[in-house]
């Protein structure tokens, strides 16, 4: 049985020309994470993997750092980059946990952090 | 031009180890990840595990109890052994370079893919 | 684990010819699929990665397209160099590979 939640930093905006942190957290759980994966929509942003550690897709090499921890680092943020953003956590022996991150990405000075939320 | 080749025993008895070197030039093996692979008659492909450029290992869970992927960086090479063979393991072994990125925070990254392999030994499991 | 089919598994083409491979992945891989060409005898050679990536080197008639599940390797103008076994693998959730297509000329 899946007994885990993943807690996300939820709606958060950020300045355009600016970075972000999107971070995930696993908890409640005590399957073995064996890979986290990052993903845009239908893009994929990056890997973690636990033994290998990250791998970054050649689109997004130039503005994607990994970290902190299992989150991602996306610089140089564009309009573009608005939209929802999933880290996929691949563990054993549960399966599949998803959570859900949406970034806004404004134009204006004033970006203000969302509540962080839960997906059981 | 990155170059590597397999060497070892081509006939294994069963419930006996399995060991392969592969010898690198043209690369060291202090930087990438380095994998095994084996191809099974039927053309069916495994990859088997890696080591890394710091020397850490990751292998296919299939396998995770029989086997252990080692190296020397004096001598360039890296191993592979796999214990309590079967004939289920006849194969044909090939080592391979998975090619690794520096990243923005200076961090080694893995790319995926496999852009230079040895040639390949045949290694039968009989008795 | 993702499973990974090629077809078709034998493909007979005259020199000249559009050659049109597919790989069929049993989830979405993104675009994390690499190909390689293998001769008989010799070591498998990289083709292309992030499914549409050319290796440095390889020649241009060689183009690879897809991203999800569907993908396709494509040589515009087959050459008699160009007979050999193709196989994909993809690097989205561990490693995995296609049973190969061979290809032989008619």
């Known amino acids: 049985m899946m007994t885990g939640t993943i807690e996300t930093t939820g709606n958060i905006s950020a300045e355009k020309g600016g970075s972000i942190i999107l971070q995930c957290h696993l908890s409640s759980t005590t399957a073995q994470v064996t890979q986290v994966n990052w993903e845009q929509q239908d893009q994929l942003l990056a890997i973690c993997n636990a033994d290998l550690g990250w791998h970054i897709s050649p689109s997004f090499k130039d503005r994607v750092a990994p970290g902190p921890g299992l989150g991602l680092t996306l610089q140089s943020l564009t309009v573009n980059d608005t939209g929802e953003y999933f880290c996929i956590y691949h563990t054993y022996p549960d399966g599949t946990y998803t959570g859900r991150i949406f970034l806004e990405v404004l134009e204006s000075s004033v970006a203000e952090h969302g509540a962080r939320f839960q997906i059981p | 031009e990155v170059q590597l080749q397999e060497s070892g025993p081509g006939l294994v008895k069963p419930s006996q180890s399995l060991s392969l070197t592969c010898s690198v030039t043209g690369s060291s093996i202090a930087s990438d990840y380095w994998g095994w692979i084996r191809k099974f008659p039927g053309n069916k492909m495994e990859w088997m595990g890696f080591i890394t450029y710091s020397g850490s290992t990751s292998y296919n869970p299939s396998l995770k109890s029989r086997i252990s992927i080692t190296r020397d960086t004096s001598k360039n090479q890296f191993f592979l052994q796999l214990h309590s063979v079967t004939t289920d393991d006849t194969a044909t072994y090939s080592c391979a370079r998975m090619p690794s990125f520096i990243t923005l925070a200076s961090l080694s990254t893995w790319e995926g893919y496999f852009d230079f392999w040895g040639p390949g030994t045949m290694v039968t499991v009989s008795s | 684990d993702i499973q990974m089919t090629q077809s078709p598994s034998l493909l007979s083409a005259s020199v000249g010819d559009r050659v049109t491979l597919n790989c069929k992945a049993s989830?979405?891989?993104?675009?994390?699929l690499a190909w390689y060409q293998q001769k008989l005898g010799e070591a498998p050679k990289f083709l292309i990665y992030y499914a549409n990536s050319l290796q440095t080197g390889i020649p241009s008639r060689f183009s690879g397209s897809g991203s999800g599940t569907d993908f396709t390797l494509t040589i515009s103008g087959l050459q008699p160099e160009d007979v050999a076994t193709y196989f994909c693998?993809?690097?989205?959730?561990?490693?995995?590979f296609g049973g190969g297509t061979k290809v032989e000329l008619k």
């Open positions: 989830q979405s891989i993104h675009k994390n």
């Open positions: 693998q993809q690097y989205y959730s561990g490693w995995t």
